[in-house]
Amino acid sequence: RSRWMKRYLTYRIYNYTPDMKREDVDYIFQKAFQVWSDVTPLRFRKLHKDEADIMILFAFGAHGDFNYFDGKGGTLAHAFYPGPGIQGDAHFDEAETWTKSFQGTNLFLVAVHELGHSLGLQHSNNPKSIMYPTYRYLNPSTFRLSADDIRNIQSLYGAPVKPPSLTKPSSPPSTFCHQSLSFDAVTTVGEKIFFFKDWFFWWKLPGSPATNITSISSIWPSIPSGIQAAYEIESRNQLFLFKDEKYWLINNLVPEPHYPRSIYSLGFSASVKKVDAAVFDPLRQKVYFFVDKHYWRYDVRQELMDPAYPKLISTHFPGIKPKIDAVLYFKRHYYIFQGAYQLEYDPLFRRVTKTLKSTSWFGC
C-alpha cells in the first residue's frame, strides 16, 4: 500500500475558497491534520510558498488532472495517495458551499476524509469511519476518529512515538577525555553531531556541554552495528550510513524501505570493499568518499559518480595522509578524524588549519 516514507510532511494551501475567511480555512486544515498527527508519529508543517508534499486547492470543473469536478453536490473533493508531484494532493470542488457549520458542506469533515487519502487510506465500508465514502454531518467540536480509522492509519505509520529513549544528558566522564578514542563515523544529523562507535553512538548539540549516548539498534533496529561511514544531506533530511558493501538511507530519522543497497549502485568499482569515511559538502553538492589512499567524488544532483575518480587523497587534500576514520562537515570546514586526532581542513584554501584531539567536541 502507498504511504509516506517520512515522518515530517509539509502542506500548502495553494488557494482559498471565497466561502470562508482565510484564517478559518487555515485553522480548519491545521485541526484536520492534527486529527491524524494525534494518532501517528506524523508531523505536519504549513508552507506559504513552493511545492509541499500535500498541496491543497479549491477548483471548479477541469483543474489539471483527469478528475473533473461535477458542480454542486455529487463529488465534493478528491485526493491522491502519497508520492511525489500531484500524489498526496487534495482538491476541493469550489462549486460546493464550504462552511464550518452544519450548513452547506463542512470543510473540516471533508478535509479529514481527504487527508486520510493523502496519507494512504482507502475508503472504508464502516459507516462510523471518517473514510466512509458518503458525506454526513458530525459536530466538529466533538469529532473523534473511529477505532477502525485509528487501526488503519496506524497499520501504515504506527502509533505516536516519544523521541527515542536516549540516556540522560551528562558531561563526559573524565576517563572519556583521557582515552585515546577513535570514531567509526561522524556526521551532523540536523543540529546534532553523531559520533558512531561499534554498536552505539554519542550525540550532542555543538556548544552544549551535554553528551548523550544510545545504541544504534534502539533507535534503528534495522541498522547494523559497526557503521563505517556516514553523511547527511540536511536540505533533504537524509542520512546515509555505510558498512562494508552496503548502505542505508535514513529519511527524517526513519529508515527507508528497500535498503540496504549495494555501494556499487553509486558507481564504485568492484575493488572497493568498504568506505572508510564520507562527507557531503553542501556548497559543492558533492559527496567525498574516502577509500584507503584514494577518494571518490559523487554528484548528488546528477546522482552519478564524477568522472576521473578515484584520485589520491595526498595529492588533492594537502596535509592529509591516509588512512581516514571519519569526516565531518561543520561550518564550512572538514574535520578529518584519524585515530585519537582530527584535522580541521579548509576546503576553500585546501589546507589544514588545526590539529585537535578527536574528543575535543566533548569539552575535553
Epitope: D65, F66, I86, H123
Partner: antibody, heavy 122, light 103 residues
Framework: EVQLLESGGGLVQPGGSLRLSCAAS????????MHWVRQAPGKGLEWVSG????????MYADSVKGRFTISRDNSKNTLYLQMNSLRAEDTAVYYC???????????????WGRGTLVTVSS | DIQMTQSPSSLSASVGDRVTITCRAN??????LNWYQQKPGKAPELLIY???SLQSGVPSRFSGSGSGTDFTLTISSLQPEDFATYYC?????FGQGTKLEIK
C-alpha cells in the same frame, strides 16, 4: 527495473480490428493506473485511453470513444487495447504508459514502453 | 476544456546555449504540468513533473518553473544529447511539441 513491452501492432484495413497488448514487469502492476498514448508519423503525442488499477474505471479520448476498449488482466500483468472500426487517422505508434497508484489518475506518465506501430491502410 | 499551447514549435541552438521553452494553459492548472523529452524513434521520457520537480536520473541542467497558466522548461547549458523534441502535458492534453535542433 520497470519494463513495458507493447505488441500486437501491424497493418490492418480501414474498418478492421486489432488488439494491442502491453506486458508489464518490475512493479506491482495491480496498483497503478495505466494508459495508451499514440503518435501519428511525424506528429505529436495524443492521449488515447486510461484504466484504473482494478479495471473498474476507464477513460477515452473523444476521437476513439465507442471504437476502442481498454482493459487489463492483473493476474497476467498485461494491459490491452481493443481497436475496432479502425480509420486511416488511427495510424500511429501506440505506447503504453504507467501513471500513479490510487483511486484517481494524474496523467503522470513516468514509464513508457517502446511502442508498437499500427498502420491502417487499404 | 483545457488546452495547452507550446512555443516555439521549433528552435535552433548550439551546444552550451541556454534554452527556454514555454507552455501556456487556457485556464489554471495550478502546478500540474509535466515535461517530456523524445528522441527520434524512441519513447518519450519524463523530465519534469509538477511544474518544477526533476524526475530521478534527469541531469540538473534541466529545470521547470511556473504555476497557474504559464510554464517554462529551461536547459541551462545545452549538451549534444539534448537535441530532441520536448512536450508539455497535463492529464490527457499534450502541447504540440518543440523540436530543438542544432544550429
Amino acid at each position: 527495473e520497470v519494463q513495458l513491452l507493447e505488441s500486437g501492432g501491424g497493418l490492418v484495413q480501414p474498418g478492421g480490428s486489432l488488439r494491442l497488448s502491453c506486458a508489464a514487469s518490475g512493479f506491482t502492476f495491480s496498483w497503478y493506473w495505466m494508459h495508451w498514448v499514440r503518435q501519428a508519423p511525424g506528429k505529436g503525442l495524443e492521449w488515447v485511453s486510461g484504466i484504473s488499477p482494478s479495471g473498474g474505471m476507464t477513460m477515452y479520448a473523444d476521437s476513439v470513444k465507442g471504437r476502442f476498449t481498454i482493459s487489463r488482466d492483473n493476474s497476467k500483468n498485461t494491459l490491452y487495447l481493443q481497436m475496432n472500426s479502425l480509420r486511416a487517422e488511427d495510424t500511429a505508434v501506440y505506447y503504453c504508459a504507467r501513471d500513479i497508484v490510487g483511486p484517481y489518475s494524474a496523467g503522470l506518465f513516468d514509464y513508457w514502453g517502446r511502442g508498437t506501430l499500427v498502420t491502417v491502410s487499404s | 476544456d483545457i488546452q495547452m499551447t507550446q512555443s516555439p514549435s521549433s528552435l535552433s541552438a548550439s551546444v552550451g546555449d541556454r534554452v527556454t521553452i514555454t507552455c501556456r494553459a487556457n485556464q489554471s492548472i495550478y502546478t500540474y504540468l509535466n515535461w517530456y523529452q523524445q528522441k527520434p524513434g524512441k519513447a518519450p521520457e519524463l523530465l519534469i513533473y509538477a511544474a518544477s520537480s526533476l524526475q530521478s536520473g534527469v541531469p540538473s541542467r534541466f529545470s521547470g518553473s511556473g504555476s497557474g497558466t504559464d510554464f517554462t522548461l529551461t536547459i541551462s547549458s545545452l549538451q549534444p544529447e539534448d537535441f530532441a523534441t520536448y512536450y508539455c502535458q497535463q492529464a490527457g492534453i499534450f502541447g504540440q511539441g518543440t523540436k530543438l535542433e542544432i544550429k
